[in-house]
């Protein structure tokens, strides 16, 4: 079961998202914001530092609809 | 236990592109998270980039523009190749695994393979 | 210059302990990013000594302990051994350079 932080890494890391964001898919990097400049992705966010759910959910492609 | 090894030429001429090869065996290549390392004579380690199996790439910015990894699935390989090479590339570059029982520590290191860039 | 700072050498006597710092930023160990260490014999390539800031793989005698508080991490090595002659180095994520970062690496040698 996923903890509300966590390090999660290679198949850990596909699982949890595939759970999280279920059918709506997931992607590993998002597009640079203009502040950053950078791109910087779900690996670096949740394999090299703790992440939680919310992080994970910023990663689904698109967001759930409202029922 | 996943083991690593580094392959390639040990000579390259200045401007020429770098390129080698690291096997997988022990383990699948669909599962981690693969490395470059290199360490100049004398000096310190310094990361070139990494991928994940999705196809999800870094690189090193210093790097970035000569840099690419790549991936052989069906050979359990991936591959650097290191465009326009100078003497600063002469190092020994090695190949590492992030197996993720590491929290992203490289937990699996090849032997390494020396490099040198001269004419 | 590295982006993670550590000291070019330090010794220690055998049976003694000795630590190595690492010093980073608010972009890197400070922004909670893990801290690994390696450890490189002679001739040889890195081994991973600790992995995320305090772990320590199976293998490795826990003589070697690492720890980390808001920018810096160490790592500190007891009951000093000849073979532990080796250089050291610290490894974290940066994220203003978004890519992994390496210290310059410490040398040390027991005297």
């Known amino acids: 079961a996923y903890r509300p932080s966590e390090t999660l890494c290679g198949g850990e890391l596909v699982d949890t998202l595939q759970f999280v964001c279920g059918d709506r898919g997931f992607y590993f990097s998002r597009p640079a914001s203009r502040v950053s400049r950078r791109s910087r992705g779900i690996v670096e966010e949740c394999c090299f530092r703790s992440c939680d759910l919310a992080l994970l959910e910023t990663y689904c492609a698109t967001p759930a609809k409202s029922e | 236990q996943v083991q690593l090894q580094e392959s390639g030429p040990g000579l390259v001429k200045p401007s020429e592109t770098l390129s080698l090869t690291c096997t997988v065996s022990g383990g699948s290549i669909s599962s981690y998270y693969w490395s470059w390392i290199r360490q100049p004579p004398g000096k310190g380690l310094e990361w070139i980039g990494y991928f994940f199996y999705s196809g999800y790439t870094n690189y090193n910015p210093s790097l970035k523009s000569r840099v690419t990894i790549s991936v052989d699935t069906s050979k359990n390989q991936f591959s650097l190749k290191l465009s326009s090479v100078t003497a600063a590339d002469t190092a020994v570059y090695y190949c590492?695994?992030?197996?993720?029982?590491?929290?992203?520590?490289?937990?699996?290191w090849g032997q390494g393979t020396t490099v040198t860039v001269s004419s | 210059q590295s982006v993670l700072t550590q000291p070019p050498s330090v010794s220690g006597a055998p049976g003694q302990r000795v630590t190595i710092s690492c010093t980073g930023s608010?972009?890197?160990?400070?922004?909670?990013?893990?801290v690994h260490w390696y450890q490189q014999l002679p001739g040889t390539a890195p081994k991973l000594l600790i992995y995320?800031?305090?772990n320590r793989p199976s293998g490795v005698p826990d003589r070697f302990s690492g720890s980390k508080s808001g920018t810096s991490a160490s790592l500190a090595i007891t009951g000093l051994q000849a073979d532990d002659e080796a250089d050291y180095y610290c490894?974290?994520?940066?994220?203003?350079?978004?890519?992994?970062?390496f210290g310059g690496g410490t040398k040390l040698t027991v005297l």
């Open positions: 590492a695994c992030i197996t993720g029982t590491t929290k992203g520590g490289m937990d699996v």
């Open positions: 995320g800031n305090n």
């Open positions: 490894q974290s994520f940066d994220s203003s350079l978004s890519g992994s970062v």
């Open positions: 608010s972009s890197n160990i400070g922004a909670g990013y893990d």
